[in-house]
Interface confidence: low
Amino acid sequence: EPHSESNVPAGHTIPQAHWTKLQHSLDTALRRARSAPAAAIAARVAGQTRNITVDPRLFKKRRLRSPRVLFSTQPPREAADTQDLDFEVGGAAPFNRTHRSKRSSSHPIFHRGEFSVCDSVSVWVGDKTTATDIKGKEVMVLGEVNINNSVFKQYFFETKCRDPNPVDSGCRGIDSKHWNSYCTTTHTFVKALTMDGKQAAWRFIRIDTACVCVLSRKAVRRA
């Protein structure tokens, strides 16, 4: 079975203390839930009214956890340095900020004179309702989990390209005389809580995780 990604691209570090604190609050709620008589957790799918029962043991396996997936009672806070950018790859409608936290600065911190080949933007996505699993099947993502009367939302830390062409010729700093280049979003698979029929189940789903530069050699013109 594939492992979920644990490394976040440099320059897009997930606020670890914040993540750990929220995971700790989830663990506390789970301990309370386990000691409760029914030990049952009601999970609600966004847009659905019926309750789904989730076994608390679903959360016991720590190897399933990825720093890119977070269960939180409140929207995760980004670092203080944020940009108010309404940008989404593919020209779709701007992000709805009632569901998504502001994204981090499009530029990671560099030393003076250092630049990024591609600009990326990162955001905690909290309104994911469907996703593509590792086999290419569209699956329903659990939006919220109700544990011991605390509603935990499932957030995904996603990183994508801000622009396929940071400069006219493509990626920044590439010798455009010899190379064609463009920036593209790459993906990874993380374990997320999804609906499997009438119950919750962990599945690997695909999320945007980095922005890389794609190069191809320009055709050599012979005299």
Epitope: V89, G90, T132, K135, G136, K137, E138, R206
Partner: antibody, heavy 125, light 112 residues
């Protein structure tokens, strides 16, 4: 090498049921969808439905809904397509095809990168 | 259902000459992720179909580079730069953006 080997030709009477098998090898059976496609004599391709062998999640075309049942046996790496209430217009070659979402950017079912050799079903009274 | 319309339905070609097949869909085949799910298949006489092109313009492994795909949205084209004898057969476009999956009627390529 990826291979999809289908069962042999069948001759059926109208109203009967046919069940065709598709045994796969050369890849992990539970990883990819298996689709079934009908091709009537001298006609084009028509998608009937597909199954995810890992959990037997099946999707059907409305044109065949109610008459077709697609199943998968993980223990033998074999997919099956059963078509009931046969009529003369069901005379066709039936193909199974492996749908590799890797080739389609993780589309729901589409890819069809490997096909079985086809099974001719003749419906005649 | 998404209707896929191919033209021409019959295409007589001269060996070594280019050939072009058009495919039009009744709905956009672009999905939310930005990908366009349009494939091209070749079916030689007496054989099973074979994947040539996936996602509009990506050649499947082992497919000769004389085959190329292009287009966007609802209009797509398969081009054969120089037709060879082994290219004779029926070519189908197919869409994977919407269920049920649907194919064009097919274009029969034959040598003049």
């Amino acid at each position: 090498e990826v291979q999809l080997v289908q069962s042999g030709a069948e001759v059926k009477k109208p109203g009967a049921t046919v069940k065709i098998s598709c045994k796969v090898s050369g890849y992990s059976f539970i990883t990819y969808w298996i689709s079934w496609v009908q091709q009537a004599p001298g006609k084009g391709l028509e998608w009937m439905g597909a199954i995810d062998p890992s959990d037997s999640d099946a999707r059907y075309s409305p044109s065949f809904q109610g008459r077709v049942t697609i199943t998968a046996d993980k223990s033998t790496d074999t997919a099956y397509m059963e078509l009931s209430s046969l009529r003369s217009e069901d005379t066709a070659v039936y193909y199974c095809a492996k749908s590799d979402p890797g080739y389609s950017g993780y589309s729901l079912l589409y890819g069809f990168d490997s096909w079985g050799q086809g099974t001719l079903v003749t419906v005649s009274s | 259902d998404v209707v896929m319309t191919q033209s021409p339905l019959s295409l007589p070609v001269t060996l070594g000459q280019p050939a072009s097949i058009s495919c039009r869909s009744s709905q956009s085949l672009v999905q939310r992720n930005g990908n366009t799910y349009l494939s091209w298949f070749q079916q030689r006489p007496g054989q099973s179909p074979r994947l040539l092109i996936y996602q509009v313009s990506n050649r499947y492994s082992g497919v000769p580079d004389r085959f190329s795909g292009s287009g966007s949205g609802t209009d797509f084209t398969l081009k054969i730069s120089r037709v060879e004898a082994e290219d004779v057969g029926v070519y189908y476009c197919g869409q994977g953006a919407h269920l049920p999956l649907t194919f064009g009627q097919g274009t029969k390529v034959e040598i003049k």
